[in-house]
Protein backbone atom coordinates (compact mmCIF):
# COMPACT_ATOMS: atom_id res chain seq x y z
CA UNK A 1 0.00 0.00 0.00
CA UNK A 2 1.10 3.54 -0.68
CA UNK A 3 2.00 6.20 1.86
CA UNK A 4 -0.26 9.22 1.36
CA UNK A 5 0.86 12.82 0.94
CA UNK A 6 -1.36 15.88 0.60
CA UNK A 7 -1.17 19.31 -0.96
CA UNK A 8 -3.60 22.02 -1.99
CA UNK A 9 -4.15 23.27 -5.51
CA UNK A 10 -1.59 25.97 -6.25
CA UNK A 11 0.88 24.74 -3.67
CA UNK A 12 4.10 22.86 -4.24
CA UNK A 13 3.76 19.17 -3.38
CA UNK A 14 6.62 17.31 -1.74
CA UNK A 15 7.14 13.56 -2.11
CA UNK A 16 10.02 12.28 0.04
CA UNK A 17 12.49 9.67 -1.16
CA UNK A 18 15.99 9.15 0.20
CA UNK A 19 18.92 6.80 0.01
CA UNK A 20 22.38 6.87 1.57
CA UNK A 21 25.15 6.73 -1.05
CA UNK A 22 27.76 4.07 -0.29
CA UNK A 23 30.41 6.78 -0.58
CA UNK A 24 30.27 10.51 -1.25
CA UNK A 25 29.60 11.10 -4.91
CA UNK A 26 28.92 7.39 -5.46
CA UNK A 27 25.43 8.00 -6.80
CA UNK A 28 22.77 5.54 -7.86
CA UNK A 29 20.41 6.13 -10.79
CA UNK A 30 16.93 7.17 -9.68
CA UNK A 31 13.72 7.68 -11.61
CA UNK A 32 10.41 9.26 -10.70
CA UNK A 33 7.32 8.30 -12.64
CA UNK A 34 3.61 9.02 -12.61
CA UNK A 35 1.90 5.73 -11.86
CA UNK A 36 2.71 2.75 -9.67
CA UNK A 37 6.20 1.27 -9.97
CA UNK A 38 6.35 -1.40 -12.69
CA UNK A 39 8.85 -4.27 -12.88
CA UNK A 40 11.58 -2.14 -14.45
CA UNK A 41 12.47 1.52 -14.21
CA UNK A 42 9.48 3.89 -13.94
CA UNK A 43 6.39 4.36 -16.05
CA UNK A 44 5.69 7.80 -17.50
CA UNK A 45 8.99 9.25 -16.28
CA UNK A 46 8.91 12.84 -15.00
CA UNK A 47 12.49 13.00 -13.70
CA UNK A 48 15.57 10.82 -13.91
CA UNK A 49 19.11 10.89 -12.55
CA UNK A 50 22.15 8.89 -13.50
CA UNK A 51 25.35 8.27 -11.54
CA UNK A 52 26.36 11.90 -11.97
CA UNK A 53 23.48 14.26 -12.48
CA UNK A 54 19.82 14.85 -13.20
CA UNK A 55 19.67 13.86 -16.87
CA UNK A 56 15.97 14.28 -17.58
CA UNK A 57 13.21 16.35 -16.08
CA UNK A 58 9.91 17.81 -17.16
CA UNK A 59 8.45 21.18 -16.28
CA UNK A 60 7.19 21.62 -12.70
CA UNK A 61 9.12 18.58 -11.43
CA UNK A 62 12.44 19.07 -9.67
CA UNK A 63 14.69 17.86 -6.89
CA UNK A 64 14.81 20.50 -4.19
CA UNK A 65 17.18 18.61 -1.88
CA UNK A 66 20.79 17.63 -2.34
CA UNK A 67 20.49 14.58 -4.55
CA UNK A 68 24.26 14.09 -4.36
CA UNK A 69 23.72 13.17 -0.71
CA UNK A 70 20.83 10.87 -1.53
CA UNK A 71 17.91 13.27 -1.09
CA UNK A 72 15.93 12.52 -4.23
CA UNK A 73 12.63 13.86 -2.91
CA UNK A 74 10.40 15.20 -5.66
CA UNK A 75 8.86 18.65 -5.65
CA UNK A 76 5.92 19.28 -7.96
CA UNK A 77 5.38 22.97 -8.54
CA UNK A 78 1.98 24.65 -8.48
CA UNK A 79 -0.09 21.47 -8.36
CA UNK A 80 -3.52 21.00 -9.90
CA UNK A 81 -6.12 18.31 -9.26
CA UNK A 82 -4.71 16.43 -12.26
CA UNK A 83 -1.48 15.84 -10.32
CA UNK A 84 -3.31 13.51 -7.92
CA UNK A 85 -2.35 9.88 -8.09
CA UNK A 86 0.42 7.39 -7.44
CA UNK A 87 4.05 8.32 -8.01
CA UNK A 88 6.95 5.89 -8.17
CA UNK A 89 10.38 6.61 -6.76
CA UNK A 90 12.81 3.92 -7.90
CA UNK A 91 16.36 3.73 -6.60
CA UNK A 92 18.24 1.58 -9.10
CA UNK A 93 20.79 -0.07 -6.85
CA UNK A 94 23.29 -2.09 -8.90
CA UNK A 95 23.09 -5.85 -8.79
CA UNK A 96 20.55 -8.58 -9.32
CA UNK A 97 17.04 -7.42 -8.48
CA UNK A 98 18.49 -4.98 -5.96
CA UNK A 99 16.59 -1.84 -6.76
CA UNK A 100 14.19 -0.29 -4.28
CA UNK A 101 10.81 1.02 -5.29
CA UNK A 102 8.40 3.22 -3.39
CA UNK A 103 4.84 4.07 -4.33
CA UNK A 104 3.67 7.40 -2.93
CA UNK A 105 0.09 8.58 -3.19
CA UNK A 106 -0.45 12.28 -3.77
CA UNK A 107 -3.84 13.69 -2.85
CA UNK A 108 -4.58 17.20 -4.08
CA UNK A 109 -7.27 19.15 -2.28
CA UNK A 110 -9.03 22.19 -3.71
CA UNK A 111 -7.55 25.45 -2.47
CA UNK A 112 -9.28 27.08 0.46
CA UNK A 113 -10.95 30.26 -0.74
CA UNK A 114 -10.12 32.87 1.89
CA UNK A 115 -10.07 36.62 1.23
CA UNK A 116 -6.59 37.96 1.86
CA UNK A 117 -4.94 41.39 1.79
CA UNK A 118 -3.10 42.38 -1.37
CA UNK A 119 0.23 42.31 0.42
CA UNK A 120 -0.20 38.58 1.18
CA UNK A 121 -0.86 37.81 -2.44
CA UNK A 122 2.27 39.78 -3.34
CA UNK A 123 4.22 37.72 -0.80
CA UNK A 124 2.86 34.52 -2.30
CA UNK A 125 3.97 35.58 -5.75
CA UNK A 126 7.40 36.61 -4.51
CA UNK A 127 8.06 33.50 -2.40
CA UNK A 128 5.95 30.71 -3.94
CA UNK A 129 8.22 27.89 -2.74
CA UNK A 130 8.20 29.07 0.85
CA UNK A 131 4.49 28.68 1.33
CA UNK A 132 4.59 24.91 1.68
CA UNK A 133 6.59 23.44 4.53
CA UNK A 134 7.21 19.80 5.13
CA UNK A 135 5.39 18.19 8.00
CA UNK A 136 6.75 15.62 10.40
CA UNK A 137 4.29 12.91 9.34
CA UNK A 138 3.92 11.29 5.93
CA UNK A 139 0.42 12.62 5.33
CA UNK A 140 1.03 16.07 6.75
CA UNK A 141 1.35 19.29 4.79
CA UNK A 142 1.74 22.52 6.70
CA UNK A 143 0.85 25.81 5.10
CA UNK A 144 0.97 29.38 6.23
CA UNK A 145 -2.67 29.83 5.31
CA UNK A 146 -4.22 33.24 5.79
CA UNK A 147 -1.94 35.84 7.33
CA UNK A 148 -4.05 38.99 7.80
CA UNK A 149 -2.38 40.11 11.04
CA UNK A 150 1.27 39.63 10.16
CA UNK A 151 3.23 42.67 9.03
CA UNK A 152 5.88 42.63 6.30
CA UNK A 153 8.74 42.42 8.79
CA UNK A 154 7.17 39.38 10.41
CA UNK A 155 6.57 37.83 7.01
CA UNK A 156 10.21 38.33 6.09
CA UNK A 157 11.33 36.73 9.36
CA UNK A 158 8.91 33.83 8.92
CA UNK A 159 10.10 33.30 5.37
CA UNK A 160 13.69 33.11 6.54
CA UNK A 161 12.76 30.64 9.26
CA UNK A 162 10.96 28.48 6.71
CA UNK A 163 13.88 28.61 4.34
CA UNK A 164 16.33 27.71 7.07
CA UNK A 165 14.22 24.97 8.63
CA UNK A 166 15.48 21.43 8.66
CA UNK A 167 12.17 19.65 8.53
CA UNK A 168 13.43 17.54 5.66
CA UNK A 169 15.65 15.75 8.17
CA UNK A 170 12.59 14.78 10.19
CA UNK A 171 11.04 13.34 7.07
CA UNK A 172 13.83 10.84 6.83
CA UNK A 173 12.11 9.04 9.69
CA UNK A 174 8.80 8.76 7.87
CA UNK A 175 9.61 8.98 4.16
CA UNK A 176 11.05 6.46 1.74
CA UNK A 177 14.64 5.87 2.82
CA UNK A 178 17.15 3.23 1.83
CA UNK A 179 20.75 2.81 2.94
CA UNK A 180 23.26 1.51 0.43
CA UNK A 181 26.57 -0.11 1.28
Amino acid sequence: SEVEYRAEVGQNAYLPCFYTPAAPGNLVPVCWGKGACPVFECGNVVLRTDERDVNYWTSRYWLNGDFRKGDVSLTIENVTLADSGIYCCRIQIPGIMNDEKFNLKLVIKPAKVTPAPTRQRDFTAAFPRMLTTRGHGPAETQTLGSLPDINLTQISTLANELRDSRLANDLRDSGATIRIG
Epitope: C31, G35, A36, P38, V39, E51, Y56, P94, G95, M97
Partner: antibody, heavy 125, light 108 residues
Framework: EVHLVESGGGLVKPGGSLKLSCAAS????????MHWVRQAPEKGLDWIAY?????????????YYADTVKGRFTISRDNAKNTLFLQMTSLRSEDTAMYYC?????????????WGQGTSVTVSS | QIVLTQSPAIMSASPGKKVTLTCSAS???????LYWYQQKPGSSPKLWIY???NLASGVPARFSGSGSGTSYSLTISSMEAEDAASYFC?????????FGGGTKLEIK
Protein backbone atom coordinates in the same frame (compact mmCIF):
# COMPACT_ATOMS: atom_id res chain seq x y z
CA GLU B 1 17.02 4.54 -37.28
CA VAL B 2 17.10 2.10 -34.36
CA HIS B 3 18.79 -1.15 -35.32
CA LEU B 4 19.39 -4.26 -33.18
CA VAL B 5 21.26 -7.25 -34.60
CA GLU B 6 21.63 -10.48 -32.64
CA SER B 7 24.37 -13.04 -33.30
CA GLY B 8 26.02 -16.05 -31.68
CA GLY B 9 23.23 -18.60 -31.96
CA GLY B 10 23.75 -22.14 -33.17
CA LEU B 11 23.55 -25.82 -32.32
CA VAL B 12 24.84 -26.85 -28.90
CA LYS B 13 24.68 -30.04 -26.86
CA PRO B 14 22.76 -30.25 -23.56
CA GLY B 15 24.93 -28.92 -20.74
CA GLY B 16 26.87 -26.77 -23.18
CA SER B 17 27.37 -23.01 -23.31
CA LEU B 18 26.78 -20.24 -25.79
CA LYS B 19 27.23 -16.48 -25.75
CA LEU B 20 24.79 -14.30 -27.66
CA SER B 21 25.48 -10.73 -28.72
CA CYS B 22 23.23 -7.88 -29.73
CA ALA B 23 24.80 -4.98 -31.62
CA ALA B 24 22.86 -1.73 -31.25
CA SER B 25 22.93 1.34 -33.47
CA UNK B 26 20.81 4.39 -34.25
CA UNK B 27 20.34 5.48 -30.63
CA UNK B 28 22.35 6.28 -27.52
CA UNK B 29 22.76 2.73 -26.27
CA UNK B 30 24.00 3.75 -22.80
CA UNK B 31 20.70 5.56 -22.09
CA UNK B 32 18.51 2.49 -22.42
CA UNK B 33 17.76 -0.65 -20.49
CA MET B 34 17.81 -3.81 -22.62
CA HIS B 35 16.00 -7.16 -22.59
CA TRP B 36 16.44 -10.67 -23.89
CA VAL B 37 13.21 -12.42 -24.88
CA ARG B 38 12.95 -15.85 -26.45
CA GLN B 39 10.39 -17.74 -28.50
CA ALA B 40 10.36 -21.52 -28.76
CA PRO B 41 9.32 -22.91 -32.17
CA GLU B 42 5.60 -22.25 -32.77
CA LYS B 43 5.23 -20.96 -29.22
CA GLY B 44 4.67 -17.71 -27.40
CA LEU B 45 7.14 -15.13 -26.15
CA ASP B 46 9.12 -15.68 -22.99
CA TRP B 47 10.95 -12.83 -21.22
CA ILE B 48 14.28 -14.00 -19.79
CA ALA B 49 16.45 -11.09 -18.67
CA TYR B 50 16.77 -7.31 -18.34
CA UNK B 51 19.69 -4.97 -17.65
CA UNK B 52 19.32 -1.29 -16.85
CA UNK B 53 21.25 1.40 -18.68
CA UNK B 54 24.24 1.68 -16.36
CA UNK B 55 25.03 4.80 -18.32
CA UNK B 56 28.36 5.59 -16.69
CA UNK B 57 29.62 2.05 -16.22
CA UNK B 58 28.01 -1.32 -16.79
CA UNK B 59 28.86 -2.21 -13.17
CA UNK B 60 26.12 0.20 -12.12
CA UNK B 61 23.36 -1.75 -13.86
CA UNK B 62 20.34 -3.29 -12.18
CA UNK B 63 19.62 -6.79 -13.48
CA TYR B 64 16.52 -8.99 -13.52
CA TYR B 65 16.21 -12.64 -14.56
CA ALA B 66 13.33 -15.04 -15.11
CA ASP B 67 13.37 -17.88 -12.58
CA THR B 68 13.83 -20.42 -15.39
CA VAL B 69 17.27 -19.06 -16.28
CA LYS B 70 18.49 -17.69 -12.94
CA GLY B 71 21.94 -19.08 -12.14
CA ARG B 72 22.47 -20.36 -15.69
CA PHE B 73 22.26 -17.22 -17.84
CA THR B 74 24.12 -13.93 -17.36
CA ILE B 75 23.13 -10.69 -19.03
CA SER B 76 25.76 -7.98 -19.48
CA ARG B 77 26.52 -4.99 -21.66
CA ASP B 78 29.45 -3.06 -23.06
CA ASN B 79 28.32 0.53 -23.48
CA ALA B 80 31.59 1.52 -25.17
CA LYS B 81 30.88 -1.04 -27.91
CA ASN B 82 27.08 -0.58 -27.98
CA THR B 83 26.65 -4.28 -27.38
CA LEU B 84 24.41 -6.43 -25.19
CA PHE B 85 25.36 -9.99 -24.24
CA LEU B 86 23.70 -13.14 -22.95
CA GLN B 87 26.03 -15.82 -21.61
CA MET B 88 24.14 -19.12 -21.46
CA THR B 89 25.45 -22.12 -19.57
CA SER B 90 24.07 -25.54 -18.56
CA LEU B 91 21.82 -25.41 -21.60
CA ARG B 92 18.78 -27.67 -21.77
CA SER B 93 16.59 -28.82 -24.62
CA GLU B 94 13.85 -26.46 -23.41
CA ASP B 95 16.18 -23.52 -24.06
CA THR B 96 15.81 -24.16 -27.79
CA ALA B 97 14.31 -20.98 -29.18
CA MET B 98 14.76 -17.84 -31.21
CA TYR B 99 16.44 -15.26 -28.96
CA TYR B 100 15.59 -11.59 -29.42
CA CYS B 101 17.12 -8.53 -27.84
CA UNK B 102 14.77 -5.61 -27.26
CA UNK B 103 15.24 -2.02 -26.17
CA UNK B 104 13.39 -0.70 -23.13
CA UNK B 105 12.05 2.83 -23.47
CA UNK B 106 13.41 4.67 -20.44
CA UNK B 107 10.60 7.25 -20.58
CA UNK B 108 8.33 4.46 -19.40
CA UNK B 109 5.79 4.79 -22.18
CA UNK B 110 6.65 2.26 -24.87
CA UNK B 111 8.15 -0.63 -22.95
CA UNK B 112 10.04 -2.93 -25.32
CA UNK B 113 9.79 -0.60 -28.26
CA UNK B 114 12.33 -2.06 -30.71
CA TRP B 115 13.35 -5.66 -31.28
CA GLY B 116 16.13 -7.34 -33.23
CA GLN B 117 15.52 -9.98 -35.89
CA GLY B 118 16.61 -12.78 -33.53
CA THR B 119 19.26 -15.48 -33.41
CA SER B 120 18.35 -19.17 -33.29
CA VAL B 121 19.60 -21.47 -30.54
CA THR B 122 19.12 -25.22 -30.77
CA VAL B 123 20.02 -27.46 -27.83
CA SER B 124 20.17 -31.06 -28.96
CA SER B 125 22.39 -34.10 -28.65
CA GLN C 1 3.30 -14.70 -11.56
CA ILE C 2 0.54 -13.16 -13.64
CA VAL C 3 -0.72 -15.55 -16.30
CA LEU C 4 -2.15 -13.91 -19.40
CA THR C 5 -4.65 -16.04 -21.29
CA GLN C 6 -5.52 -15.03 -24.83
CA SER C 7 -8.58 -16.14 -26.69
CA PRO C 8 -9.25 -17.40 -29.18
CA ALA C 9 -5.95 -19.11 -29.90
CA ILE C 10 -6.66 -19.05 -33.64
CA MET C 11 -9.35 -17.19 -35.53
CA SER C 12 -10.10 -16.23 -39.09
CA ALA C 13 -12.02 -13.17 -40.23
CA SER C 14 -13.32 -11.91 -43.53
CA PRO C 15 -12.12 -8.58 -44.89
CA GLY C 16 -14.22 -5.72 -43.51
CA LYS C 17 -15.35 -7.65 -40.44
CA LYS C 18 -14.89 -6.42 -36.89
CA VAL C 19 -12.44 -8.51 -34.86
CA THR C 20 -11.94 -8.59 -31.09
CA LEU C 21 -9.07 -10.40 -29.39
CA THR C 22 -9.14 -10.80 -25.63
CA CYS C 23 -6.46 -11.06 -22.97
CA SER C 24 -7.43 -12.21 -19.48
CA ALA C 25 -5.02 -11.81 -16.54
CA SER C 26 -4.90 -14.14 -13.56
CA UNK C 27 -4.64 -11.09 -11.29
CA UNK C 28 -5.03 -7.38 -11.74
CA UNK C 29 -2.65 -5.57 -14.09
CA UNK C 30 -2.12 -1.81 -14.18
CA UNK C 31 -3.53 -0.55 -17.47
CA UNK C 32 -0.39 1.57 -17.88
CA UNK C 33 1.67 -1.58 -18.29
CA LEU C 34 -0.53 -3.72 -20.56
CA TYR C 35 0.84 -3.87 -24.10
CA TRP C 36 0.11 -5.65 -27.38
CA TYR C 37 2.63 -6.84 -29.97
CA GLN C 38 2.06 -7.94 -33.54
CA GLN C 39 4.24 -10.65 -35.09
CA LYS C 40 4.21 -11.94 -38.63
CA PRO C 41 5.83 -15.26 -39.65
CA GLY C 42 9.60 -15.00 -39.93
CA SER C 43 9.66 -11.56 -38.31
CA SER C 44 10.28 -10.21 -34.83
CA PRO C 45 7.48 -8.80 -32.70
CA LYS C 46 6.48 -5.16 -33.18
CA LEU C 47 5.07 -2.90 -30.52
CA TRP C 48 1.42 -2.41 -31.52
CA ILE C 49 -0.49 -0.94 -28.59
CA TYR C 50 0.97 0.50 -25.39
CA UNK C 51 -0.63 1.40 -22.08
CA UNK C 52 -3.81 -0.52 -22.99
CA UNK C 53 -5.19 1.89 -25.57
CA ASN C 54 -2.43 3.90 -27.27
CA LEU C 55 -1.45 2.97 -30.80
CA ALA C 56 2.26 2.69 -31.55
CA SER C 57 3.70 4.74 -34.38
CA GLY C 58 2.50 3.54 -37.79
CA VAL C 59 -0.36 1.41 -36.48
CA PRO C 60 -3.57 1.97 -38.51
CA ALA C 61 -6.43 3.77 -36.77
CA ARG C 62 -8.73 0.77 -37.30
CA PHE C 63 -6.95 -0.80 -34.31
CA SER C 64 -7.98 0.04 -30.77
CA GLY C 65 -7.32 -1.30 -27.31
CA SER C 66 -9.28 -1.20 -24.10
CA GLY C 67 -9.67 -2.80 -20.71
CA SER C 68 -8.71 -2.62 -17.06
CA GLY C 69 -7.98 -4.89 -14.12
CA THR C 70 -7.93 -8.45 -15.42
CA SER C 71 -9.72 -8.01 -18.75
CA TYR C 72 -8.21 -6.42 -21.86
CA SER C 73 -8.97 -6.48 -25.55
CA LEU C 74 -7.63 -5.49 -28.95
CA THR C 75 -10.19 -4.61 -31.61
CA ILE C 76 -9.89 -4.20 -35.37
CA SER C 77 -12.88 -2.23 -36.63
CA SER C 78 -12.57 -3.54 -40.19
CA MET C 79 -10.30 -6.49 -40.93
CA GLU C 80 -7.76 -6.10 -43.73
CA ALA C 81 -5.44 -8.69 -45.27
CA GLU C 82 -2.33 -7.03 -43.82
CA ASP C 83 -3.73 -7.52 -40.30
CA ALA C 84 -3.24 -11.29 -40.56
CA ALA C 85 -0.62 -12.01 -37.90
CA SER C 86 -0.16 -13.25 -34.35
CA TYR C 87 -0.96 -10.83 -31.54
CA PHE C 88 0.53 -11.13 -28.06
CA CYS C 89 -0.55 -9.25 -24.96
CA UNK C 90 2.16 -8.44 -22.45
CA UNK C 91 2.31 -7.05 -18.91
CA UNK C 92 5.22 -5.49 -17.06
CA UNK C 93 3.17 -4.39 -14.08
CA UNK C 94 4.58 -7.05 -11.78
CA UNK C 95 7.50 -9.48 -11.72
CA UNK C 96 8.06 -11.46 -13.80
CA UNK C 97 6.89 -9.71 -16.95
CA UNK C 98 4.75 -12.12 -18.91
CA PHE C 99 3.24 -12.59 -22.36
CA GLY C 100 0.00 -14.20 -23.38
CA GLY C 101 0.11 -17.32 -25.52
CA GLY C 102 -0.95 -15.30 -28.54
CA THR C 103 -3.86 -15.22 -30.95
CA LYS C 104 -3.18 -16.17 -34.55
CA LEU C 105 -5.43 -14.08 -36.76
CA GLU C 106 -5.99 -15.31 -40.28
CA ILE C 107 -7.81 -13.76 -43.22
CA LYS C 108 -10.69 -15.70 -44.74
Amino acid sequence: EVHLVESGGGLVKPGGSLKLSCAASGFTFSDYGMHWVRQAPEKGLDWIAYISSGSISSDSSTIYYADTVKGRFTISRDNAKNTLFLQMTSLRSEDTAMYYCARHDWRGLYGMDYWGQGTSVTVSS
Amino acid sequence: QIVLTQSPAIMSASPGKKVTLTCSASSSVSSSYLYWYQQKPGSSPKLWIYSTSNLASGVPARFSGSGSGTSYSLTISSMEAEDAASYFCHQWSSYPPTFGGGTKLEIK
